[in-house]
C-alpha cells in the first residue's frame, strides 16, 4: 500500500507593513514543532496593497476597507482554511503615521479605527494595529536580517548556506530607508552608547547584544525631497526652481500647500508670493549632493561623535545590510553589485543625473514617471546619507551589502516584529526539544 503523507504541522503569521508610501502584507510559515529554532520561519507571500500609505486616507477613511481587501483575500487563499482562526494578523504603521499623529492624534486614531474594523472582519486572529516606534523599526529590522543570515545560530559551519555569510557569529548592522524615515542599527565595538535613547539590550538564544539604533524621522527619501524643495524654494527669486536633482528638461508644477502639508518642512516654511512653483531639472549630481548636505546639521554635537542633527553615532563596525529603499533605488540604478566601489557609484550617478529627461523616459518606458523622475534625487540622497550622514568612507563602502531578500524572505522589520510577538526568539539557547519560553525582547 502507498504511504500517505502526514498533514504538515505548520503555522502561519501575517504582518502588514503600513508604510508612508504604501502598505505591504507578508505571510510567514514555520514548522509548529520547531518554533524555538533559529532560521525556520520563512516568507511565503508578499502582497503589495494598491494605492498610497494609510496616512493618505485621512480624508477618505471609508475607503480603507476596500483598499485592504485584495491582499487580505490573497491571505485567505494562501493560508489553509483550517488554519485561519489561529493565524495572527499584526499591522504595524511606521513614519507616515508618526507624522500624521504629530499633526493630529484624532486623525491618526480615525485611520487606526477603520483599519481595526476592517481587519477584524477577516477569519484570522487579529492582534491589533499600532504605530510602532522608530526604535522598534530599527531593532526588528536588525533582528530580521541577522535571523535570516543565521547569526543567532550557535552551530558553527565550515560551509556557507546563505549569501553574505562570513562564517562567524558577528552580526550585521541594518540600514533601512523608507519614505518618511531611515534607521541605522548595529552592535558597536566595545563602545559605550553615550545616549540612552539609542541603546538596546537583547538576550537572544543565550547571547547578550548591546545594540545602537536611531530612526531619523523626516529623513526617508520622500520626506527628504520635500525638505530639500522647501529649503531651496526659500531662496528662489521667482516661481521657477532650477533643481540639480532632476534630469535636464524635466518640468513639474508643485503646490506650495502640498509642500507645507508635512511636519517635515515646518522649519523651512515661509510666506511665498506664489501658490505654485515649477521645478525645472538641470541634472547636476554635484550640486544636488551639495543641496542635500544642507539638510544635515553637522555643526552641533553634544557627544564624542554624531551622525547629524546632534544625534549620537558610534564608530561604524562590521558589515551592514542596506534594505528597503536603499535596495530598491540602487537595484534600479544597477548599483547593488558587491564589486562596485563607492567612487564608481558616484561616477554612475553623475552620468545618470546628467541624462536628459526625454532620453530617460525612452530608456525606461515601463516605469511610472513619478518614480522615474526621482531616482536621480534618491540615488544622490542615498550616497549623501551613507557618506556624510553615517560616515561611511570609500573603504568601508565595501561593507555595505544592498539586500532585497535573504533566503526568499524580504529584509525589513516585519519578520522580526512577528518573531517577537509570537514569542519565537527565546532569550536562552533552546534545548534540542523546545521546552519553555524565557524572556522575550
Amino acid at each position: 500500500t502507498q504511504n500517505k503523507a502526514l498533514p504538515e504541522n505548520v503555522k502561519y503569521g501575517i504582518v502588514l507593513d503600513a508604510g508612508s508610501s504604501h502598505t505591504s502584507l507578508y505571510i510567514y510559515k514555520w514548522p509548529a514543532e520547531k518554533e524555538n529554532d533559529t532560521g525556520v520561519v520563512h516568507q511565503v507571500e508578499e502582497c503589495r496593497v494598491k494605492g498610497p500609505g494609510i496616512s493618505k486616507f485621512v480624508q477618505k477613511v471609508n475607503e480603507i476597507g476596500i483598499y485592504l481587501t485584495d491582499c487580505m483575500e490573497r491571505a485567505r487563499e494562501v493560508i489553509p482554511r483550517s488554519q485561519h482562526q489561529e493565524t495572527p494578523v499584526y499591522l504595524g504603521a511606521t513614519a507616515g503615521m508618526r507624522l500624521l499623529r504629530m499633526e493630529s492624534e484624532e486623525l491618526a486614531d480615525r485611520v487606526l479605527d477603520v483599519v481595526e474594523r476592517s481587519l477584524s472582519n477577516y477569519p484570522f486572529d487579529f492582534q491589533g494595529a499600532r504605530i510602532i516606534t522608530g526604535q522598534e523599526e530599527g531593532a526588528y529590522g536588525w533582528i530580521t536580517i541577522n535571523y535570516l543570515l543565521g547569526k543567532f545560530s550557535q552551530k558553527t559551519r565550515w560551509f556557507s548556506i546563505v549569501p553574505y555569510e562570513t562564517n562567524n557569529q558577528e552580526t550585521f548592522g541594518a540600514l533601512d530607508l523608507g519614505g518618511a524615515s531611515t534607521q541605522v542599527t548595529f552592535v558597536p565595538q566595545n563602545q559605550t552608547i553615550e545616549s540612552p535613547d539609542n541603546a538596546l539590550q537583547f538576550r537572544l538564544y543565550g547571547k547578550d547584544y548591546n545594540v545602537y539604533t536611531h530612526s531619523f524621522l523626516c529623513y526617508g527619501k520622500d520626506q527628504a525631497l520635500w525638505q530639500k524643495l522647501a529649503k531651496d524654494i526659500q531662496v528662489a527669486s521667482n516661481e521657477i526652481l532650477r533643481d540639480p536633482c532632476f534630469h535636464p528638461g524635466y518640468k513639474k508644477v508643485v503646490n506650495v500647500s502640498d509642500l507645507y502639508k508635512t511636519p517635515c518642512t515646518k522649519r523651512f516654511e515661509m510666506t511665498l508670493p506664489f501658490q505654485q512653483f515649477e521645478i525645472q531639472g538641470i541634472g547636476n549630481y554635484q550640486q544636488c549632493h551639495q543641496s542635500i548636505l544642507e539638510l544635515f546639521n553637522t555643526s552641533y554635537c553634544p557627544y564624542s561623535q554624531c551622525a547629524f542633527n546632534g544625534i549620537f553615532l558610534p564608530p561604524l563596525q562590521g558589515d551592514f545590510g542596506a534594505f528597503s529603499a536603499f535596495y530598491f533605488v540602487m537595484k534600479f540604478l544597477n548599483l547593488t553589485s558587491e564589486k562596485v566601489s563607492q567612487e564608481k557609484v558616484t561616477e554612475m550617478m553623475k552620468k545618470f543625473c546628467a541624462q536628459p529627461w526625454e532620453e530617460i523616459k525612452t530608456s525606461y518606458a515601463g516605469v511610472k514617471e513619478k518614480y522615474l523622475s526621482e531616482y536621480c534625487f534618491s540615488g544622490t540622497y542615498i550616497l549623501s546619507l551613507l557618506l556624510q550622514g553615517y560616515h561611511f568612507t570609500a573603504d568601508s563602502w565595501e561593507h555595505i551589502h544592498f539586500i532585497g531578500k535573504i533566503q526568499g524572505s524580504d529584509a525589513g522589520w516585519t519578520l522580526g516584529y512577528m518573531l517577537n510577538l509570537t514569542n519565537m526568539i527565546p532569550a536562552e539557547q533552546p534545548l534540542s526539544t523546545p521546552l519553555s519560553h524565557s524572556t522575550y525582547v
Epitope: E106, A108, D113, R117, I131, E136
Partner: nanobody, 115 residues
Framework: EVQLVESGGGLVQPGGSLRLSCAAS????????MSWYRQAPGKAREWVGS????????TYQNSVKGRFTISRDNSKNTLYLQMNSLRAEDTAVYYC????????RGQGTLVTVSS
C-alpha cells in the same frame, strides 16, 4: 501631560471574574480610541482589544472573545475591562493605552489567575 492609571487587578481563581479600570487625564478622552494590552512573564506584550472613541465599536483578539468586554465612560474619563471565565493563561500585567500611542504610559495592574 497624558496620564493613564490602571487599577483593579488581583488574585482570582480560574473561572472567576475581575473588572479593571483605567483613569485617563491630560487629553480629551472622548476623542480617542483606547486599547488594552497585557504582558505575561517572559512573553512579549500582547494586544487584548480596542474600543472606538465613542464606544460604539469594540474588537478583541480571539483568545479573549466572548470572555472579555471593553467599555468606557467618557463622562468619567475611564476605560474598563470586564474579564470573565478567567484562565491561568490570562495571568499578566494589564495596561491601557491610547490607540495612537506606541507604548503604554501607565504602570499596569497585575492579574493573577491561580487556584
Amino acid at each position: 501631560e497624558v496620564q493613564l492609571v490602571e487599577s483593579g487587578g488581583g488574585l482570582v481563581q480560574p473561572g472567576g471574574s475581575l473588572r479593571l479600570s483605567c483613569a485617563a487625564s491630560g487629553f480629551t478622552f472622548s476623542n480617542l480610541g483606547m486599547s488594552w494590552y497585557r504582558q505575561a512573564p517572559g512573553k512579549a506584550r500582547e494586544w487584548v482589544g480596542s474600543i472606538s472613541a465613542s464606544g460604539d465599536y469594540t474588537t478583541y483578539q480571539n483568545s479573549v472573545k466572548g470572555r472579555f468586554t471593553i467599555s468606557r465612560d467618557n463622562s468619567k474619563n475611564t476605560l474598563y475591562l470586564q474579564m470573565n471565565s478567567l484562565r491561568a493563561e490570562d495571568t499578566a500585567v494589564y495596561y491601557c493605552t491610547r490607540r495612537v500611542d506606541s507604548y503604554p504610559r501607565g504602570q499596569g495592574t497585575l492579574v493573577t489567575v491561580s487556584s
